[in-house]
């Protein structure tokens, strides 16, 4: 079952997700999506990193941590009730079926 995180309407929500890079800057692609983690990739992607940098995001979604050291925790700004639901953090480790998948449940009060 998903770990549950709470935030209040109008506040920022924080959804933690971490991995350990082989070396700082030697990154593994990560995606964040709205909805449970599918078989591959992320559905409804809101933010993505590649081996170099954060390469895609939409308004209100950003990384507040040191992502080049593996802190890919997602911040969602100024949340509304519509932001409630499951979010997927997927660490896209090279190789077959190596991905680490985390489903996080966001509850907005």
């Amino acid at each position: 079952s998903e770990v549950e995180y709470r935030a209040e309407v109008g506040q920022n929500a924080y959804l933690p997700c971490f991995y350990t890079p082989a070396a700082p800057g030697n990154l593994v692609p990560v995606c964040w999506g709205k909805g449970a983690c599918p078989w591959s990739q992320c559905g409804n992607v809101v933010l993505r990193t590649d081996e170099r940098d954060v390469n895609y995001w939409t308004s209100r979604y950003w990384l507040n941590g040191d992502f080049r050291k593996g802190d890919v925790s997602l911040t969602i700004e100024n949340v509304t009730l519509a932001d409630s639901g499951i979010y997927c953090c997927r660490i896209q480790i090279p190789g077959i079926m190596n991905d680490e998948k985390f489903n996080l449940k966001l509850v907005i009060k």
Epitope: P24, G25, R52, D53, V54, W57, T58, S59, R60, W62, L63, N64, G65, D66, F67, R68, K69, E77, N78
Partner: antibody
Framework: QIQLVQSGPELKKPGETVKISCKAS????????MSWVKQAPGKGLKLMGW????????TYADDFKGRFAFSLETSASAAYLQINNLKNEDTATYFC??????????????WGQGTTLTVSS | DIVMTQSPATLSVTPGDRVSLSCRAS??????LHWYQQKSHESPRLLIK???QSISGIPSRFSGSGSGSDFTLSINSVEPEDVGVYYC?????????FGGGTKLEIK
């Protein structure tokens, strides 16, 4: 293509107020922060701070707290720098520069052309 | 604030030379170091990010290296249009300070 277009040169007297604009085009304005950088004549670059274009929350470097204010007109994809109670040492070129919102992504990939401010009595 | 120190202040080179510009941070900033070029009467332009990552549209003769507190910008074969001032920037800790710049001149 992505562009940041700033307002024209300004000549002001000490004690006056100036408001410099930076109009963005070619990308979704609220997905990037906007930074302001000062360059005094013949000197290097100094970051003044930046503004979150989604929330409007500004962050000021210590040397630019008090007389300086960042603001937005989101509907016009525009950011503004206002300097109050102008001093001679405010004479400089001011640049706006695009910054991703992520805390550890602090390179500036697009810059305005600069606005020259001259403060003289 | 982290202090960024660049050397030399001025570099006079001949077209075709390979040159190295140095930048030192007053404390470790990992690889959060960015390089900019500013030509006379122009805005700065991002050349390299994260110490060594290339930027789309920037000629391949520009490269960066280093980590921690010591960094280098290299220009493999200087061309006349490379004249200008080169700035390094601390991208690790606010207020993301810039170095004082290295002025590149052509002999």
């Amino acid at each position: 293509q992505i562009q940041l277009v700033q307002s024209g040169p300004e000549l002001k007297k000490p004690g006056e107020t100036v408001k410099i604009s930076c109009k963005a085009s070619g990308y979704t304005f609220t997905t990037y922060g906007m930074s302001w950088v000062k360059q005094a004549p013949g000197k290097g670059l100094k970051l003044m701070g930046w503004i979150n274009t989604y929330s409007g929350a500004p962050t000021y470097a210590d040397d630019f707290k008090g007389r300086f204010a960042f603001s937005l007109e989101t509907s016009a994809s525009a950011a503004y720098l206002q300097i109050n109670n102008l001093k001679n040492e405010d004479t400089a070129t001011y640049f706006c520069a695009r910054k991703p919102p992520h805390y550890y992504v602090n390179s500036f990939d697009y810059w305005g052309q600069g606005t020259t401010l001259t403060v003289s009595s | 604030d982290i202090v960024m120190t660049q050397s030399p202040a001025t570099l006079s080179v001949t077209p075709g030379d390979r040159v190295s510009l140095s930048c030192r941070a007053s404390q470790s900033i990992s690889d959060y170091l960015h390089w900019y070029q500013q030509k006379s009467h122009e805005s700065p332009r991002l050349l390299i990010k994260y110490a060594s990552q290339s930027i789309s549209g920037i000629p391949s003769r520009f490269s960066g290296s280093g980590s921690g507190s010591d960094f280098t910008l290299s220009i493999n074969s200087v061309e006349p249009e490379d004249v200008g001032v080169y700035y390094c920037q601390n991208g690790h800790s606010f207020p993301y300070t810039f170095g004082g710049g290295t002025k590149l001149e052509i002999k």
